[in-house]
Interface confidence: low
């Protein structure tokens, strides 16, 4: 499990770096953050470390009430502060690993998913 979570953490951070450059990666991370009410890998401050993301900005999908541009010059009280790796990882543990529905090899597909899909260039609106 620790290995799975470590890989998921590394992959999530890697995809964060791709967020400003790849629209399809952005769309998947946006949906994850919106669905799981989380922001960043460990927490929302992780977005500060992304070179091509401007300071004082997180994706709009981090906002508690998502509106266009809500992540720019955000107020801490208006965004989800909890990190996605722990939150999604906890969900995976509860719903997947503990039910023994999938193996660690299957979870490896989650790492593969976005990186394989990134080979295709998708635009979004």
């Amino acid at each position: 499990r620790d290995k799975v979570m470590s890989e998921f953490n590394n992959n999530f951070r890697q995809q964060m770096e791709n967020y400003p450059k790849n629209n399809h990666t952005a769309s998947i991370l946006d949906r994850m953050q919106a669905d799981f009410k989380c922001c960043g890998a460990a927490n929302y401050t992780d977005w500060e470390k992304i070179p091509s993301m401007s300071k004082n900005r997180v994706p709009d999908s981090c906002c508690i009430n998502v509106t266009v541009g809500c992540g720019i010059n955000f107020n801490e009280k208006a965004i989800h502060k909890e990190g996605c790796v722990e939150k999604i990882g906890g969900w995976l543990r509860k719903n997947v690993l503990e039910q023994k529905l999938i193996s660690e090899e299957d979870l490896g597909g989650e790492q593969k998913l976005i990186s394989e899909e990134d080979l295709h260039h998708h635009h979004h609106h």
Epitope: D30, D60, S61, V96, I102, G109, E110, L113, E116
Partner: antibody
Amino acid sequence: QVQLVESGGGLVKPGGSLRLSCAVSGFTYTDYFMNWIRQAPGKGLEWVSYISNSGAIKYYADSVKGRFTISRDNAKNSLYLQMNGLRADDTAVYYCVRDPRSYYGFDYWGQGTLVTVSS
Amino acid sequence: DIQMTQSPSSLSASVGDRVTITCRASQSISNFLNWYQQKPGKAPRLLIYGASNLQSGVPSRFSGGGSGTDFTLTISSLQPADFATYYCQQSFSNPPVTFGQGTRLEIN
């Protein structure tokens, strides 16, 4: 009970436009992402577009990008699909669909509205 | 995009039979797989979510299984109301979600 009722379908010529509407009731609309999913006659299901609960996040299938626009009016509990540049292969029943969370399936569907694109 | 392939495309069976429909994903989707039933002229109905969880109100004769790339929908004892078309759908890569081509279950 949860209800989703589509309207606005009909016959339109290729290149024409149509606006579909979906009136929802029976749940807190602002809690849910919403989708349009279509089904060509005698064919399978194809996801078209989704919109986040606030309306800020929107995504489209490649087949409709640049031609279709999804929107919602949370005050009116309504979902819309503006369809421009319609083509024959857009002919389908269009369903308005509630999306509780991306990993839990589409739990409520409208009855559908038929869009026919033909000259 | 992730491709979903169902088999068989159509299936004939009798009331009381045990029936299994399979769905294969082009890459691992963990357990993010849903099953729907659709009757002619009606909207699809969610049966199973998360590969194996029964949606509220769905009879217990329906069950789902599998993980990774291979999944099954099983009807333990077919009832007249079960003759319909069944679709699988992945929600792992979202957007876009993708559906299988459908399996038509007919009366033998």
